[in-house]
Amino acid sequence: MAVTACQGLGFVVSLIGIAGIIAATCMDQWSTQDLYNNPVTAVFNYQGLWRSCVRESSGFTECRGYFTLLGLPAMLQAVRALMIVGIVLGAIGLLVSIFALKCIRIGSMEDSAKANMTLTSGIMFIVSGLCAIAGVSVFANMLVTNFWMSTANMYTGMGGMVQTVQTRYTFGAALFVGWVAGGLTLIGGVMMCIACRGLAPEETNYKAVSYHASGHSVAYKPGGFKASTGFGSNTKNKKIYDGGARTEDEVQSYPSKHDYV
């Protein structure tokens, strides 16, 4: 019961986590214009992995997708890749874990197969969570670096002048969503891995060795005496004898003059 609960909870936590990773990846507020020096600005900018948005004090917002792949910073591309890998792994993990759930019966799937699938999905969730956390952390590090390194520069051309504005960007809501979602996916993955240990059947195959007792040829079968309470299948408390030294698999029970007790 505890294993099913752990597995089920792991699945739900991972599901929430992956939904959060998808939400964070799609959100526009990865970085927001720092308004510390200009709190009454009419217009401010916030940017995501895929597009840039401007919002004015009236609430009117306009977003435009980035034009090109080539003109974007390598770090941004890396963050995009990490988040997409996280989503893909998480989605595959969810698909695998649905079939691995103990509460769902699919044909004659053995517990060992379910255990392997649970472990596989757990590992996928862990990697997915780590990808999301890494992606968000790389982006956050980029923001912090740019925040302290930002400089204004100017260049002229064609009679006019273009000035690069010293705009500082700070952490957007998507970063916090990403961190929490990545953490949840990671926790869900760990729970699935823990559940896997409980699902795996304990295969302890004992080969019963025959012992030769003095006076009689006795092959002692472990479990020959089943509980005297009468709950076992061997309610007559039979002992099993055989003349030869055989393994448990070979032992046969013959009616004999030595049947007693």
């Epitope: 970085s31 009419a42 217009v43 900018n45 940017q47 840039s52 948005c53 401007v54 004015e56 004090s57 009236s58 009117f60 306009e62 435009r64 980035y66 034009f67 003109g71 974007l72 910073p73 941004l76 740019n146 006019g160 002048m161 273009v162 000035q163 690069t164 504005v165 705009t167 960007y169």
Partner: nanobody
Framework: QVQLVESGGGLVQPGGSLRLSCAAS????????TGWYRQAPGKQRDLVAT???????NYADSVKGRFTISRDKSKNTAYLQMDNLKPEDTAVYFC??????????????WDAGTQVTVSS
């Protein structure tokens, strides 16, 4: 690279009208605000009017009721309609655009300016 092309300046009599236009071109992602500053001889540059991407306008007190700023979003162009011009409106008018050109790349572009002279 962002470029601004301004047109419409010239000589006009007091009480007359002029229309300035300012077209922004280049790899512009978001055009945040567009507007005009002016600089009279021997004076500092003053704000005339601004318009945000959403259409919110702002005017200097000296031009309120006489000047109207508008924009054509599809052409990334702003217009300054100047009516009932006075001799004190004589100045070099500079168009500017505050733009986002890429990821965490915000720039303010200025044009070279156009002369507006109000004289009889």
């Amino acid at each position: 690279q962002v470029q601004l092309v301004e047109s419409g300046g010239g000589l006009v009599q007091p009480g007359g009208s002029l229309r300035l236009s300012c077209a922004a071109s280049g790899s512009i992602l978001n055009l945040m605000t567009t507007g005009w500053y002016r600089q009279a001889p021997g004076k500092q540059r003053d704000l005339v009017a601004t318009i945000t991407f959403g259409g919110t306008t702002n005017y200097a007190d000296s031009v309120k009721g006489r000047f109207t700023i508008s924009r054509d979003k599809s052409k990334n162009t702003a217009y300054l309609q100047m009516d009932n011009l006075k001799p004190e409106d004589t100045a070099v008018y500079f168009c500017y655009a505050d733009v986002i050109v890429g990821f965490q790349d915000r720039r303010v572009a200025w044009d070279a300016g156009t002369q507006v002279t109000v004289s009889s």
